[in-house]
Amino acid sequence: LTLVAPSSVFEGDSIVLKCQGEQNWKIQKMAYHKDNKELSVFKKFSDFLIQSAVLSDSGNYFCSTKGQLFLWDKTSNIVKIKVQELFQRPVLTASSFQPIEGGPVSLKCETRLSPQRLDVQLQFCFFRENQVLGSGWSSSPELQISAVWSEDTGSYWCKAETVTHRIRKQSLQSQIHVQRIPISNVSLEIRAPGGQVTEGQKLILLCSVAGGTGNVTFSWYREATGTSMGKKTQRSLSAELEIPAVKESDAGKYYCRADNGHVPIQSKVVNIPVRIPVSRPVLTLRSPGAQAAVGDLLELHCEALRGSPPILYQFYHEDVTLGNSSAPSGGGASFNLSLTAEHSGNYSCEANNGLGAQCSEAVPVSISGPDGYRRDLMTAGV
């Protein structure tokens, strides 16, 4: 009785055991044995097939037959079969097992094929806890993670398998702990059109941190009340709070705070002055008598009731600029005029504090006295 079998195979290979005897033998049963343990029993001569060999299939194999009596009456030769490792158990390596939050990590699933079977193609898959990473199975033994966050902390492992799926091996689990950088240097910055905060216009309060990783919660506060004006949580080093239309009452001191789960850090207090555009000024004319006459000193007083100083006032007779006067601390300004016969007509003034100019209503003046006013002495039309 002879057992024919390969003596050396690789994981995943199929193994055929053939037990051969005299053809005229009458047998009641035949069996295959491994390491003295019965594997399988047949009523006639049959092959024994191991579909996909594993390392544990290594051992001493023989076959036996049984005649009419109950004893196994014939035993074959012993064939020692050695199942060789096709590729080593993979080892998971990482560019860093304690990466900084927000930074990249490169994972590698390292293994080695048997030198006799370098033609075998493998594929790889990476896992965190029980979750597949990336796009799943790939021919590349590397996985690039562009940015890791604190919630990515956990157990990582990888699997390697032949593309035929016959052999699959898994690495040991490795702990990756993502390091969070605390917040540093919080600053509050004002962004406003033209660089100055003006009533009615948009204001942006920009809260920035010099360093810090992960989700940062930014909050803005008014110092006087200490109440939060707004809160934003985002994965960035800055956040904006927009005030669409600033009111005069919004003037005051502000600060912001940033927190990424460590100690919250506060910015310095920033004072925000709100500049008020001038309101429409009122022009008041004062002359010695009820009726302006040649030689009178006419005082033109222009005042905008609202508006941040300094305010520049300009005085007009018709479209001619007579002069200007500044009110450095706000309030009104005056301009004096010695009246002549030609000073009849409409007077107006303009207030401007750099946030836009406003013109008063025109105030008519008629001069009494010699040669009374004849509008520039022109009687003819255009």
């Epitope: 030689g295 007779h317 001619v320 600029t321 002069g323 010695s338 016969a341 006295g369 520039d376």
Partner: antibody
Framework: EVQLQQSGPELVKPGASMKISCEAS????????MNWVKQSRGKNLEWIGL????????TYNQKFKGKATLTVDQSSSTAYMELLSLTSEDSAVYFC?????????WGQGTLVTVSA | DIVMTQSQRFMSTSLGDRVSVTCKAS??????VAWYQQKPGQSPKALIY???YRYSGVPDRFTGSGSGTDFTLTISNVQSEDLAEYFC??????????FGGGTRLEIK
Amino acid sequence: EVQLQQSGPELVKPGASMKISCEASGYSFTAYIMNWVKQSRGKNLEWIGLINPYNGETTYNQKFKGKATLTVDQSSSTAYMELLSLTSEDSAVYFCARGLYWFPYWGQGTLVTVSA
Amino acid sequence: DIVMTQSQRFMSTSLGDRVSVTCKASQNVITNVAWYQQKPGQSPKALIYSASYRYSGVPDRFTGSGSGTDFTLTISNVQSEDLAEYFCQQYTNYPMWTFGGGTRLEIK
């Protein structure tokens, strides 16, 4: 009828001073601003300054401060312009002109020649 | 100071023609512009004030137009007595009045 009558032509030596007159008639002299204008040989017109005959207030073109002095005599309805420290650059025709912003009435002009 | 530029020093025209004299201000003078006519040996004569208003007694063949920085004096149907020098003047900032350099109108 409004009329502005200026004094006649003058030939003066460099360094000297002289006064031009402008006598107004046909209107109330003190009720209107009087201006003075220089016209050089190149025909360019330059505004020198103005005077309010009612109170004698003057305003000068920066260029002519220290060169021209404007005065009035209300009793004779006459405006005067004195030109100081004359040089050849001051040779020109000088006009008096009535008006607050633009000038509907002009004197006939006074030719001043500065020559050694 | 506001500079008034009359780019054409001389202009030639024929009697009966229409001619336009231009004046450009170095900044916005609204409509505070006057035009004067001056004949040799005479004093200037006011023609137009406030850019487009004709002064009393001025023939209606003289027309002023423009605002801001560009101004034009148009003489239609030019007569022999119109051959003279024409000056523009701005009076927008009291009292720094400035004149253009003048444009002499001549017969071709």
